[in-house]
Interface confidence: low
């Protein structure tokens, strides 16, 4: 008996071929006996079968000997032996049908879980593998679980349906709902402007929800709310700011939150918030500033810097063109009784400068100029 | 780290069955294909057949007669038994984890274990 | 059964040649083919997967390529340490067949 696999919402094309080239009687049955169609000359007729409306035939093929049952819009429950009959001959054919379906919206948060159900017909014992589209492979039976989905899930899942031998493929487009980044790190001098930017890693046509930043200064005990506000259709507008400070947020995707100024007082780490319409659970990214300013008092100048730095970030003064004076793994580097000259104090990472502020000392008689 | 280990006796007589057993550790027998092949000395590879952790076989014809494989899921174990076995199926014996029919390849495999049939 | 047919049997190359190895389906088998490395004594280790995967932690002078019938392995600078059998293996459909292997040794 041969057997084809179909695929939910799908037509299958059953085939039946006599040994004569030309048009002949022939009948389709299922496996009670009902008629499902047949032929009276070159007129198609059908039976009083469930498939009455979905099912058809290729009249333009009945004068090679063919006579195929094309079945639309497949349904698990059309799972069955079909019989054709033709030159006194009988040709079974088993037609099994399987559906895929995500247990859930194919829209999904970062971390949350992936389910897929296999629909299958009784007697039926299918194997599932499928991969995703960054080629993990998840196998099971009836039901196939991920959790903890990751960004790079995004996309279209392939899973292959193995049942006697035969395959059958699905392909399911999952999109995972994340900020392009986890976290970013913004440096800046003290009193520049500071621009946080919060670039989402989909697209949908509608995006509706509300938003929070909360931060966490180095020098607070608690954090604090920041800014709220709401999305609607991709458009942002502010429902609740703090004084102090004041950010200024963009009205259009991507997210985009201004701080006017960056202070000592500021350095710290913030976690944007999500939540999106529809979903539970929420979409983070935390974001890092570190402030760095430059100061001579008296005879000291001073570097220093706040906010969440790594251990291995070095911190250094060096008058321009020169070797540097100071360098250590701190938060802050002094000279006492600097040389005149346009000093610079660095932090960098493994060679790479991160932050550069410079401030000019004068002969002993003469104030500093700050740049 | 997934290791399999295959376990048996070396030398079987000729017309009895040749029994083997591969553990699983470091890992669950679920959700995969567990496949045996053998290479006879001096030769390629043959595909003996897979279980899948639900219980379906799939065995080369060439062998089906005389092959089954089973699965014990409590203890991380599989096995295979071969009747009537002759000269011919003189071999090493490996388990291999089989990623599946769509795609992967058998990523994990034992070490092997050699098989005489001598009497 | 779809039979693989891997060319050539043997091949002796110096250390840093390019090694090409071929192995044809004897049906369309789309891109269902695996390739294998075996060392003496060792069990075989899965090298490409899906034709041109390179499977985790095998060095990128491995490589694969190829879909249908024919398809190419290809190790870009040999070194001492490929001395080995190299096999394809078909998933197209049942029962799995491997090619007859390429014995690769250093001149």
């Known amino acids: 008996k041969k057997v084809v696999l179909g695929k939910k919402g799908d037509t299958v094309e059953l085939t039946c071929t006599a040994s004569q080239k030309k048009s002949i009687q022939f009948h389709w049955k299922n496996s009670n006996q009902i008629k499902i169609l047949g032929n009276q000359g070159s007129f198609l007729t059908k039976g009083p079968s469930k498939l009455n409306d979905r099912a058809d035939s290729r009249r333009s093929l009945w004068d090679q000997g063919n006579f195929p049952l094309i079945i639309k819009n497949l349904k698990i429950e059309d799972s069955d032996t079909y019989i054709c009959e033709v030159e006194d001959q009988k040709e079974e054919v088993q037609l099994l049908v399987f559906g895929l379906t995500a247990n859930s919206d194919t829209h999904l948060l970062q971390g949350q879980s992936l389910t897929l159900t296999l629909e299958s017909p009784p007697g039926s014992s299918p194997s599932v593998q499928c991969r995703s589209p960054r080629g993990k492979n998840i196998q099971g039976g009836k039901t196939l679980s991920v959790s903890q989905l990751e960004l790079q899930d995004s996309g279209t899942w392939t899973c292959t349906v193995l049942q006697n031998q035969k395959k059958v493929e699905f392909k399911i487009d999952i999109v995972v709902l994340a900020f392009q980044k986890a976290s970013s790190i913004v440096y800046k001098k003290e009193g520049e402007q500071v621009e946080f930017s919060f670039p989402l890693a989909f697209t949908v046509e509608k995006l509706t929800g509300s938003g929070e930043l909360w931060w966490q200064a180095e020098r607070a005990s608690s954090s604090k709310s920041w800014i709220t506000f709401d999305l609607k259709n991709k458009e942002v507008s502010v429902k609740r700011v703090t004084q102090d400070p004041k950010l200024q947020m963009g009205k259009k995707l991507p997210l985009h939150l201004t701080l006017p100024q960056a202070l000592p007082q500021y350095a710290g780490s913030g976690n944007l918030t999500l939540a999106l319409e529809a979903k539970t659970g929420k979409l983070h990214q935390e974001v890092n500033l570190v402030v760095m300013r430059a100061t001579q008092l008296q005879k000291n100048l001073t570097c220093e810097v706040w906010g969440p730095t790594s251990p291995k970030l070095m911190l250094s003064l060096k008058l321009e063109n020169k070797e540097a004076k100071v360098s250590k793994r701190e938060k802050a580097v002094w000279v006492l009784n600097p040389e005149a000259g346009m000093w610079q104090c660095l932090l960098s990472d493994s060679g790479q400068v991160l932050l550069e502020s410079n401030i000019k000392v004068l002969p002993t008689w003469s104030t500093p100029v700050q740049p | 780290q997934v290791q399999l280990q295959e376990s048996g006796p070396g030398l079987v007589k000729p017309s009895e069955t040749l029994s083997l057993t591969c553990t699983v550790s470091?890992?669950?027998?679920?959700?995969?294909?567990w496949s045996w092949i053998r290479q006879p000395p001096g030769k390629g590879l043959e595909w003996i057949g897979y279980?899948?952790?639900?219980?379906?076989?799939n065995y080369n014809p060439s062998l089906k007669s005389r092959v089954t494989i089973s699965v014990d899921t409590s203890k991380n174990q599989l096995s295979l038994k071969l009747r009537s076995v002759t000269a011919a199926d003189t071999a090493v014996y490996y388990c291999?984890?089989?990623?599946?029919?769509?795609?992967?390849?058998?990523?994990?495999w034992g070490q092997g274990t050699t098989v005489t049939v001598s009497s | 059964d779809i039979q693989m047919t891997q060319s050539p049997s043997s091949l002796s190359a110096s250390v840093g040649d390019r090694v090409t190895i071929t192995c044809q389906a004897s049906?369309?088998?789309?891109?269902?083919l695996n390739w294998y490395q075996q060392k003496p004594g060792k069990a075989p280790k899965l090298l490409i997967y899906?034709?041109?995967n390179l499977e985790t932690g095998v060095p990128s002078r491995f490589s694969g390529s190829g879909s249908g019938t024919d398809f190419t392995f290809a190790i870009s600078s040999l070194q001492p340490e490929d001395i080995a059998t190299y096999y394809c293996?078909?998933?197209?459909?049942?029962?799995?067949?491997f090619g007859g292997g390429t014995k690769v040794e250093i001149k």
């Open positions: 470091g890992g669950s027998i679920s959700h995969y294909y």
């Open positions: 279980i899948h952790y639900s219980g379906t076989t």
């Open positions: 899906d034709a041109s």
């Open positions: 049906q369309d088998i789309s891109n269902y």
């Open positions: 293996q078909q998933y197209d459909n049942l029962p799995l067949t």
């Open positions: 291999a984890r089989d990623q599946g029919f769509s795609s992967g390849g058998m990523d994990v």
